[in-house]
Interface confidence: low
């Protein structure tokens, strides 16, 4: 391509006329601001092609780039084009106008950019300033392009003096965009609501500044659109939030709510979904089984736990024998109900160092304005057995009796055993169990009493021994669910009667 005049920079006078010629071995064309101005194209007898661009009545607005390029680039190097820059110094034109999008310069990384403020006269001195500052910034200026450098997120203006007047350019805004892979989170104020209550969902994107939110939800499918609200969380940089608010929910609003977020710079997208349940009214539901009979061991601590689901949050009360329980100042009873998830609760009654008096009928009641549930159980205090008395007597009948008395809860079992060889018993020889009906030499009589006040059983057992001919170790063992206790007595034979 051959351009005349060759440039690459021309300074032309205002109101003048100027002719640009471009020729080449294939059809050629002049371009100005991505368009083809009116021009004369011709083909010479030697086969060369030319295009003549006539610029008439020049003004400052004709300042800029002119390109000559092949009209049809098939089979040709696409990069073959000639650039010419023309200045038309014009005191009536300050800075050349910019398209609106040139005033906003977006960056996704730290890189050199150009603030494209250009003048019509290459002799003018142009300076760059922050919009609210007078100090000229030390940034190199190219009359054909503007100021190039690395800029912070600020507003900038260019200044020049034409004759005796100072001229300011439009403001240029530099934005460094935060762009990263999209990470969306969706949450709801409540995932369970009653009809008539509000559904409020929030979709939050972190690490991006320019994103588009799109919600899908049950109402949308029936053509009833809800306008979301988007805001920036000012206290958290690069957190953008879209809020979907549905007032006065209906049963049909139950379902999946999806937030889809797209980021246009790198064309990333992500979506998250959440399920919302609209119920006609609140509910309280017990989860799991709690037996109607519960046990606690005397002087030990015991926690009774009830798990339930509820919405809205319920009031929880505990009762013992129809009297309301509260945390005791002495620390003997502790009540707690904790929210383990949005609608799941665990209520605990802790009895510290359990006393006999704490046995009884317990009820937990959970309720709110829509529903209630109650759960009752009997608490039995288990008391380890203890042998209170083991005594031997010689009634006139000639037989010998051993009496064993003990207490415990639940009812203790009694086991009698005896050992005849005192030296070897019980380490080497196992004791013999007594009281079986097949044994004629011993008889057993056992009585059981329940003491209401102490809430425990008393067992009294009498062992009758028919023939004791040598010392005998007799052992009474009481056993129940929470322990056992043993006592031992040596029974000696009756001495022979004294004869005169």
């Amino acid at each position: 391509l051959v351009v005349t005049p060759p440039g690459p920079e021309l300074v032309l006078n205002v109101s003048s006329t100027f002719v640009l010629t471009c020729s080449g071995s294939a059809p050629v064309v002049w371009e100005r601001m991505s368009q083809e101005p009116p021009q004369e194209m011709a083909k010479a007898q030697d086969g060369t092609f030319s295009s003549v661009l006539t610029l008439t009545n020049l003004t400052g607005l004709d300042t800029g780039e002119y390109f000559c390029t092949h009209n049809d680039s098939r089979g040709l190097e696409t990069d073959e084009r000639k650039r010419l820059y023309i200045f038309v110094p014009d005191p009536t034109v300050g800075f050349l106008p910019n398209d609106a999008e040139e005033l906003f310069i977006f960056l996704t990384e730290i890189t050199e950019i150009t603030i494209p403020c250009r003048v019509t006269d290459p002799q003018l001195v142009v300076t760059l300033h922050e919009k609210k500052g007078d100090v000229a910034l030390p940034v190199p200026y190219d009359h054909q392009r503007g100021f190039s450098g690395i800029f912070e997120d600020r507003s900038y203006i260019c200044k020049t003096t034409i004759g005796d007047r100072e001229v300011d350019s439009d403001a240029y805004y530099v934005y460094r965009l935060q762009v990263s892979s999209i990470n969306v989170s969706v949450n709801a104020v409540q995932t369970v609501v009653r009809q008539g209550e509000n559904i409020t969902l929030m979709c939050i994107v972190i690490g991006n500044e320019v994103v588009n939110f799109e919600w899908t939800y049950p109402r949308k499918e029936s053509g009833r659109l809800v306008e979301p609200v988007t805001d920036f969380l000012l206290d958290m940089p690069y957190h953008i939030r879209s809020i979907l608010h549905i007032p006065s929910a209906e049963l049909e609003d139950s379902g999946t709510y999806t937030c889809n977020v797209t980021e246009s710079v790198n064309d990333h997208q992500d979506e998250k979904a959440i399920n919302i349940t609209v119920v006609e009214s609140g509910y309280v539901r017990l989860l799991g089984e709690v037996g109607t009979l519960q046990f606690a061991e005397l002087h030990r601590s015991r926690t009774l736990q009830v798990v339930f689901e509820a919405y809205p949050p319920p009031t929880v009360l505990w009762f013992k024998d129809n009297r309301t329980l509260g945390d005791s100042s002495a620390g003997e009873i502790a009540l707690s109900t904790r929210n383990v998830s949005e609608t799941r609760y665990v209520s605990e009654l802790t009895l510290v160092r359990v006393k006999v008096a704490e046995a009884g009928h317990y009820t937990m009641r959970a309720f709110h304005e829509d529903a209630e549930v109650q759960l009752s159980f009997q608490l039995q205090i288990n008391v380890p057995v203890r042998v209170l008395e083991l005594s031997e007597s010689h009634p006139d009948s000639g037989e010998q009796t051993v009496r064993c008395r003990g207490r415990g809860m639940p009812q203790p079992n009694i086991i009698w055993s005896a050992c005849r060889d005192l030296k070897r018993c019980p380490r080497e020889l196992p004791p013999t169990l007594l009281g079986n009906s097949s044994e004629e030499e011993s008889q057993l009589e056992t009585n059981v009493t329940y003491w209401e006040e102490e809430q425990e059983f008393e067992v009294v057992s009498t062992l009758r021994l028919q023939h004791v001919d040598r010392p005998l170790s007799v052992r009474c063992t009481l056993r129940n669910a929470v322990g056992q206790d043993t006592q031992e007595v040596i029974v000696v034979p009756h001495s022979l009667p004294f004869k005169v």
Partner: nanobody, 124 residues
Framework: EVQLVESGGGLVQAGGSLRLSCAAS????????MAWFRQAPGKERDFVAS????????YYADSAQGRFTISRDSAKNTVYLEMNSLKPEDTAVYYC?????????????????WGQGTQVTVSS
Amino acid sequence: EVQLVESGGGLVQAGGSLRLSCAASGRTFNGYAMAWFRQAPGKERDFVASITWSYGYTYYADSAQGRFTISRDSAKNTVYLEMNSLKPEDTAVYYCAADPKASRFRILRQYAHWGQGTQVTVSS
């Protein structure tokens, strides 16, 4: 003024069935909860079953589950309690109740309006 009138009570053998009716009048009952309660001699009034007027959601006491069925006929403004496999312990005065807050259908007391009751006696 809301009025509730119960009927259908009577004497029945154990194992038998009865159908109680509650005629409601005085207003439209959309948004209401309707319920049946019962009171045996010398005992407190106990919840039996409930239903929401608009949507027909139901709720039963443990003692009624599987044997009793609550229903409503909006056109006739009537609530029913179908009672099968009756036992002597079902003997009581049965009351119809209504509350303007439908969401109360799972609550076991505190209904705003009550009927006069109908006697059910189950003999062994």
